[in-house]
């Protein structure tokens, strides 16, 4: 029935960071196009990326509707120029993705140290609360808004003059740490979701050191 040169998509893979979520697959199309459908376990299928020659589809708009739901996607293959054509069973070839639960699986993006302020022997280090594409009441939520106390940050800090590191944790976006007066310190943070079993930790933030622009010093 005209689909002999159409191949099913394979290696369907979710790529997701801070809820920005793209489905990728293979192969690069030769004389065929793809359409993607996504649904929750109990929901209806919604079509996206119609008749595309791309091998990726941005599904962020769909998954941010409820990041705690589990989603399934499927990729349909059609002959180029004959998208009405169906397979031998009367429907186009398709392949299912693995299930994907954004809240449990989206990668934590590399955090950024927003600022640090020294007052005497205390330093307040603030982690930028990154905006996500998850919405509530028409406003975009931050990572902290979405994860709440499930998200913690680990701070690594050390004297610029030595290699010995210290660490502290917070389930807000701020650290208040003790430092030695007159010493410059460097800082790096990592996001962690302790309750997860996969994609638990982010990469470390870029290192920021006292004596550079982000900091402030007060007696």
């Amino acid at each position: 029935s005209g689909t002999t040169n159409t191949v099913a998509a394979y290696n369907l893979t979710w790529k997701s960071t801070n809820f920005k979520t793209i489905l990728e697959w293979e192969p690069k199309p030769v004389n065929q196009v793809y359409t993607v459908q996504i649904s929750t376990k109990s929901g209806d299928w919604k079509s996206k990326c119609f008749y595309t020659t791309d091998t990726e589809c941005d599904l962020t708009d769909e998954i941010v509707k409820d990041v705690k739901q589990t989603y399934l996607a499927r990729v349909f293959s059609y002959p180029a120029g004959n998208v009405e054509s169906t397979g031998s069973a009367g429907e186009p070839l398709y392949e299912n993705s693995p299930e994907f639960t954004p809240y449990l699986e989206t990668n934590l993006g590399q955090p950024t140290i927003q600022s640090f302020e020294q007052v005497g022997t205390k330093v307040n280090v603030t982690v930028e609360d990154e905006r996500t594409l998850v919405r509530r009441n028409n406003t975009f939520l931050s990572l902290r808004d979405v994860f709440g106390k499930d998200l913690i940050y680990t701070l690594y800090y050390w004297k610029s003059s030595s290699s010995g590191k210290k660490t502290a944790k917070t389930n807000t976006n701020e650290f208040l740490i003790d430092v030695d007066k007159g010493e410059n310190y460097c800082f790096s943070v990592q996001a962690v979701i302790p309750s997860r079993t996969v994609n638990r930790k982010s990469t470390d933030s870029p290192v920021e050191c006292m004596g550079q622009e982000k900091g402030e010093f007060r007696e």
Epitope: K169, N171, P194, S195, K201
Partner: antibody
Framework: EVQLVESGGGLVQPGGSLRLSCAAS????????MHWVRQAPGKGLEWVGW????????IYDPKFQDRFTISADTSKNTAYLQMNSLRAEDTAVYYC??????????WGQGTLVTVSS | DIQMTQSPSSLSASVGDRVTITCKAS??????LSWYQQKPGKAPKLLIY???GEPEGVPSRFSGSGSGTDFTLTISSLQPEDFATYYC?????????FGQGTKVEIK
């Protein structure tokens, strides 16, 4: 099933060195922090230090910083504790533990290190 | 460094008794406190985390409370298998520190 198995303990002379291993199975160590904790005979628990195996970041109790080194080999799913310039007071059972960042949920059975001439 | 002062260092109790162990931090550790049980010759076992969280498999007679600097582990009705040594651990900042331990013995 998550398991941690320490090895490498034994009798060593004062001033000597020893490398302890903590072989993990049932999970990937790079997804967690790994700690070493020790317990001298009849005494309480004492934290030695941690490693984030994914990036190699290490943190020590300052009293161990100069003599002990924690490392990890993610390809072997194993964490290590290298102990140098050992003293009689380092005699203890050494445990490795997995840290979720909220708690130490799995511990090894421990390996005994005896420092004596 | 944060010091953890655990008390009592030992106590004698009977099966069915309510037992309370306290840990006091030398400064605010927020919620970064967990409790461990250790039996002779065995590795410590997690009992309570984030002051109040209970891992799967831990009997409901174990509970935690407190915040900031003062924390409590309560065993509501002591069972024969609960005779052991209990430790608190602060892991909010390095160096992480354990309490000195509380040995719960049979009266």
């Amino acid at each position: 099933e998550v398991q941690l198995v320490e090895s490498g303990g034994g009798l060593v002379q004062p001033g000597g060195s020893l490398r302890l291993s903590c072989a993990a199975s049932g999970f990937n160590i790079k997804d967690y922090y790994m700690h070493w904790v020790r317990q001298a005979p009849g005494k309480g628990l004492e934290w030695v230090g941690w490693i984030d195996p994914e990036n190699g970041n290490t943190i020590y109790d300052p009293k161990f910083q100069d003599r002990f080194t924690i490392s990890a080999d993610t390809s072997k799913n194993t964490a290590y504790l290298q102990m140098n310039s050992l003293r009689a007071e380092d005699t203890a059972v050494y445990y490795c533990a997995r840290d979720t960042a909220a708690y130490f949920d799995y511990w090894g059975q421990g390996t005994l290190v005896t420092v004596s001439s | 460094d944060i010091q953890m002062t655990q008390s009592p260092s030992s106590l004698s109790a009977s099966v069915g008794d309510r037992v309370t162990i306290t840990c006091k931090a030398s400064r605010d550790i927020k919620s970064y406190l967990s409790w461990y049980q250790q039996k002779p010759g065995k590795a410590p076992k997690l009992l309570i985390y984030y002051e109040t969280g209970e891992p799967e498999g831990v009997p409901s007679r174990f509970s935690g409370s407190g915040s900031g600097t003062d924390f409590t582990l309560t065993i509501s009705s002591l069972q024969p298998e609960d005779f052991a040594t209990y430790y608190c651990l602060q892991h909010g900042e390095s160096p992480f520190t354990f309490g000195q331990g509380t040995k719960v013995e049979i009266k």
